[in-house]
Amino acid sequence: SEVEYRAEVGQNAYLPCFYTLPTSGTLVPVCWGKGACPVFECGNVVLRTDERDVNYWTSRYWLNGDFRKGDVSLTIENVTLADSGIYCCRIQIPGIMNDEKFNLKLVIK
C-alpha cells in the first residue's frame, strides 16, 4: 500500500523520494508521474531527471532537495484538491527490471 502524505489547499506539498548514488557517482535517471507506477516508465510525467540534470518539468513541480546527491523529493506548489491522488517516483536503475518504484498518496484537505 502507498505511504500517505497530506497538504492543505494553497500550500506546497512535499513527496519524499531518495536513492543512493552508485559508486561511480553517476546520477540515476528518475521520473515522477501522476498515477501509480506502471510496469515501465512513469505515466503522466510531471518531472524527469537524467544522468546530468533535471531535463523536464512542468509548472508547479520542482525539486527542492539536492537531486545530484540522490534527493529527488518532489515539491508541488500551491496545491488544489485536483492534486490529490497517487504519485509515482521511479528510480530508473540500468538493467532489466532493476527500477525502484515508490507510490505515494497525496491527500489534500
Partner: antibody
C-alpha cells in the same frame, strides 16, 4: 527561439524610481525563475536575487534588500526590477537571466541584453 | 557568502595556445560550479555547468574540470573570437556568487 528582451537605457536623478522590464518568449514563462544580475561599470557580475514566476515569491540577496523589488506580469511573460530612491552607486547594467526553479539548479542559461541605468544629478 | 577567486586577472595569449583559467571557492561547493563568457558589450553566455558538463552550441574547445574548491576552465586552441571576460559562479549556496573574472586577450 528563446529570448529575453529588456527595456531601453535609463537616465535618472538621485532619489527617483526606475522600473526595468524583461519580456520572455520561446518557452513557458512560469516553468523557470527569473534572476536579476547587476554589473557596475568595469566591474564583475553580482546576483541581486530571483523571483519564482509561478508564485511570484521573490528572493533577495542581502545587499539588495530594501530599495529593490522584483515583480511579474505573467500574462505578458514579463518580469520587472524596480529600484526606489536611486543612488549614484546604482549606476550599472542590469541583466535578467533565466533560472530553473529547482533549488540546486542555479546556472543561468539565457540572458537579456542588459539595461543600462545611469544615475546622475 | 562563498567567495570565488579567479586567477589570473588578465591572460594574454596567442591564437592556437591551450590556456587554463583558475577559479577557487572559499569553501567546498562539490561540483556546483558554472562558467560564463562575456564578450565586450554583450551579455554573459553559459559555457560549462556543474564544473565539467558541456552546453549545447558551445565549441568543444571549451572544457572544465575540478571539484570541491578548485576548478579550471580550459580552452584547447584559443581563437581570436574567444577574447572577453570569463566568470566562474558558485551554484551551491545562495547568493550564488561570481568570481571577479579573468580577462582573456589576444597578443
Amino acid at each position: 527561439q528563446i529570448q529575453l528582451v529588456q527595456s531601453g537605457p535609463e537616465l535618472k536623478k538621485p532619489g527617483e524610481t526606475v522600473k526595468i522590464s524583461c519580456k520572455a518568449s520561446g518557452y513557458t514563462f512560469t516553468t523557470y525563475g527569473m534572476s536579476w544580475v547587476k554589473q557596475a561599470p568595469g566591474k564583475g557580475l553580482k546576483l541581486m536575487g530571483w523571483i519564482n514566476t509561478y508564485s511570484g515569491a521573490p528572493t533577495y540577496a542581502d545587499d539588495f534588500k530594501g530599495r529593490f523589488a522584483f515583480s511579474l506580469e505573467t500574462s505578458a511573460s514579463a518580469a520587472y526590477l524596480q529600484i526606489n530612491n536611486l543612488k549614484n552607486e546604482d549606476t550599472a547594467t542590469y541583466f535578467c537571466a533565466r533560472k530553473p526553479p529547482h533549488y540546486y539548479v542555479n546556472s543561468f542559461d539565457y540572458w537579456g541584453q542588459g539595461t543600462t541605468l545611469t544615475v546622475s544629478s | 557568502d562563498i567567495v570565488m577567486t579567479q586567477s589570473p586577472a588578465t591572460l594574454s595569449v596567442t591564437p592556437g595556445d591551450r590556456v587554463s583559467l583558475s577559479c577557487r571557492a572559499s569553501q567546498s561547493i562539490s561540483d556546483y560550479l558554472h562558467w560564463y563568457q562575456q564578450k565586450s558589450h554583450e551579455s554573459p553566455r553559459l559555457l560549462i555547468k556543474y564544473a565539467s558538463q558541456s552546453i549545447s552550441g558551445i565549441p568543444s574547445r571549451f572544457s572544465g574540470s575540478g571539484s570541491g574548491s578548485d576548478f579550471t576552465l580550459s580552452i584547447n586552441s584559443v581563437e581570436p573570437e574567444d577574447v572577453g571576460v570569463y566568470y566562474c559562479q558558485n551554484g551551491h549556496s545562495f547568493p550564488y556568487t561570481f568570481g571577479g573574472g579573468t580577462k582573456l586577450e589576444i597578443k
